[in-house]
């Protein structure tokens, strides 16, 4: 444990002021694993003035950082870059004259306490005022800054000319594009101080490249992948005071593909499981032995899980018999194309010939998600119906 501090497996605390610490506490090699430290509490350390870029990086599991009644004057911009779990920071009663948004912009902080610091009134700390104004009143802190006359001004009253939140404006609010095509998005930003502009594309799969000047930018996405449908693309404007973003949702249209079709499995119903991808939502039609399968309450399509442009479901059959054995074909189509796949199903043998289920189709339990029916497309056609399945099979079992 660092000299003048105490440690447990998950906590470091340094509160004894004499002789105190002069640098941020670091664990000795072969001691406690720094990744397991979730809380660091530092108090009364008047000679602790700086948090350097690499002081905190080893504590990747850190959730609570408290440095109070100490001498903290400077925090390096990238000090908390590796501490994505940080939730609470308390820098009460230190010697901070300025503090940048950049320290915290990547963190999802639920608490940042800065009371009792001698902040200098400038645009550099306007973001703190903006943050305060965004919070509900019970959380507001009594923050002050020193003006040119060394007078304490409540941060809530701080007015700095040419110091405000930026704005971002994306040209295309609604974006629908066909798979394989390319698009260019344009964005303009404004503000004083002049903001930086960047694109936040998340985990976009499609190839993309951007060009940005100070206040204008474009993003070109080429050979758009169907995997990017539903993803959000944001243009972000950021300056000292804060950030603004304008976002667009990408909708990609593409022809259906049946990515999964398997032999029947039995749970409390028989199920021919399938997965279909497509956008717009494909219409589904089943064929039995080459003829249209007319769905009924005994044989029907159920969609159990919808994952944006992917649909997982079953052709559900209640108590099928030997009469339902045969070839089942699924056709999925939308305006961009169609796909089809076929499987052979054997539910039971002919009476007196084959008394059990075909060993090629064992009773594997299929996970039925139990959602309400979400049929895609209208597959009803009363001609050429196949036999209904509301019978008990000859072995006396009910499926």
């Amino acid at each position: 444990c660092p000299t003048s501090c105490k440690c447990s497996a998950s906590r470091i605390w340094c509160s004894d002021p004499s002789p105190g610490i002069v640098a941020f506490p670091r664990l000795e090699p072969n001691s406690v694993d720094p990744e397991n430290i979730t809380e660091i509490f530092i108090a009364n350390q008047k000679r602790l003035e700086i948090i350097n870029e690499d002081d905190v990086e080893a504590y990747v599991g850190l959730r609570n950082l408290t440095i109070v009644d100490s001498g903290l004057k400077f925090v390096a911009h990238k000090a908390f870059l590796k501490n994505s779990n940080l939730q609470h920071i308390n820098f009460t009663r230190n010697k901070l004259t300025s503090l940048s948004r950049k320290h915290f912009r990547h963190l999802d902080l639920s608490e940042l306490i800065l009371v009792g610091n001698p902040f200098t009134c400038s645009c550099d700390i306007m973001w703190i005022k903006t943050l305060q104004e965004a919070k509900s009143s019970p959380d507001t802190q009594d923050l002050y800054c020193l003006n040119e006359s060394s007078k304490n001004i409540p941060l809530a009253n701080l007015q700095i000319p040419n110091c405000g939140l930026p704005s971002a404006n994306l040209a295309a609010p609604n974006l629908t594009v066909e798979e394989g095509k390319s698009i260019t998005l344009s964005c303009s930003v404004a503000g004083d101080p002049v903001p930086n502009m960047y694109w936040d594309v998340g985990n976009l799969v499609s190839k993309h490249m951007n060009e940005t000047s100070h206040t204008q930018g474009s993003l070109r996405i080429t050979n758009i992948s169907s995997d990017d449908s539903g993803k959000q693309i944001s243009c972000v404007a950021e300056n000292l005071v804060g950030e603004d973003q304008d976002s667009v949702n990408l909708t990609v249209h593409f022809a259906p593909t049946i990515t999964f079709l398997e032999s029947p499995t039995s749970d409390h119903h028989w199920c021919i499981p399938f997965t279909v991808k497509g956008n717009p939502k494909p219409a589904l039609q089943w064929f039995y032995n080459g003829a249209i399968l007319n769905e009924s309450k005994y044989i029907c399509t159920k969609i159990h899980v919808t994952n944006h442009t992917e649909y997982h479901g079953c052709l559900q059959l209640d108590n099928p018999t030997h009469m339902n054995n045969g070839d089942y074909t699924l056709i999925a189509k939308n305006e961009y194309g169609k796909d089809e796949k076929q499987i052979s199903a054997h539910f039971m043998g002919w009476p007196g010939i084959d008394d059990g289920a075909n060993p090629n189709y064992p009773d594997v339990i299929y996970e039925d998600y139990g959602t309400a029916a979400n049929d895609i497309g209208d597959t009803t056609n009363r001609s050429n119906e196949i036999p209904s399945t509301d019978v008990t099979d000859k072995t006396g079992r009910e499926h």
Epitope: S15, P17, S18, P19, N44, R47, G71, K95
Partner: antibody
Framework: EVQLVQSGAEVKKPGESLKISCKGS????????IGWVRQMPGKGLEWMGI????????RYSPSFQGQVTISADKSISTAYLQWSSLKASDTAMYYC?????????????WGQGTLVTVSS | QSVLTQPPSVSVSPGQTASITCSGD??????ASWYQQKPGQSPVLIIY???KRPSGIPERFSGSNSGNTATLTISGTQAMDEADYYC?????????FGTGTKLTVL
């Protein structure tokens, strides 16, 4: 060499005011906390409070809060302990103490003590 | 503010080991120091940060601290060790001394 030199013994009457001093030398006076300790005749040691001369941040033990004032003048490297109205029960030896050094050396230093006698 | 409790007196024969305890709520979470005071003298720090000895303090003085108890151990006690001993710890906003123990070497 680190030294704390305290002012001389005082004899006072109840109700009078008093300010005793502790001058530090041989170390950075503004960079370390200085504390005051009371020892009444035949009794144990009691922490009264501490001060950080660099910014005058002061902490008092609950039983001494409001009874005494701890202050420091960094320009002359001197800490003070004062009473606005002495009582007979304030009769004691008062020590100032500092811990200015790094671990591994002698890490605290005490003044020689100031004897305060309050009697009518 | 927490109270640090010590036995009022401990007696030991020369050459034997003396142990003086100091009890306080969650004392093991704080650093304990030990002071020796002889009549008419200022206190002298003999143990700091639970178990560290300042230079010039004999090896026969050792310390430990866990749970709610800190312990000062004097092995091979000598007549010159007869004195008052005080534990001390930082408690939230200031230091606290223990009630003090008079060590008598028989």
């Amino acid at each position: 060499e680190v030294q704390l030199v305290q002012s001389g013994a005082e004899v006072k009457k109840p109700g009078e005011s008093l300010k005793i001093s502790c001058k530090g030398s041989g170390y950075s006076f503004t960079s370390y906390w200085i504390g005051w300790v009371r020892q009444m005749p035949g009794k144990g040691l009691e922490w009264m409070g501490i001060i950080y001369p660099g910014d005058s941040d002061t902490r008092y033990s609950p039983s001494f809060q409001g009874q005494v004032t701890i202050s420091a003048d960094k320009s002359i490297s001197t800490a003070y302990l004062q009473w606005s109205s002495l009582k007979a029960s304030d009769t004691a030896m008062y020590y100032c103490v500092v811990r200015p050094a790094a671990a591994g050396t002698r890490i605290d230093y005490w003044g020689q003590g100031t004897l305060v006698t309050v009697s009518s | 503010q927490s109270v640090l409790t010590q036995p009022p007196s401990v007696s030991v024969s020369p050459g034997q080991t003396a142990s003086i305890t100091c009890s306080g709520d969650k004392l093991g979470d704080k650093y304990a120091s030990w002071y020796q005071q002889k009549p008419g003298q200022s206190p002298v720090l003999i143990i700091y940060q639970d178990n560290k000895r300042p230079s010039g303090i004999p090896e026969r003085f050792s310390g430990s601290n866990s749970g709610n108890t800190a312990t000062l151990t004097i092995s091979g006690t000598q007549a010159m060790d007869e004195a008052d001993y005080y534990c001390q710890a930082w408690d939230s906003s200031t230091y606290v001394f223990g009630t003090g123990t008079k060590l008598t070497v028989l």
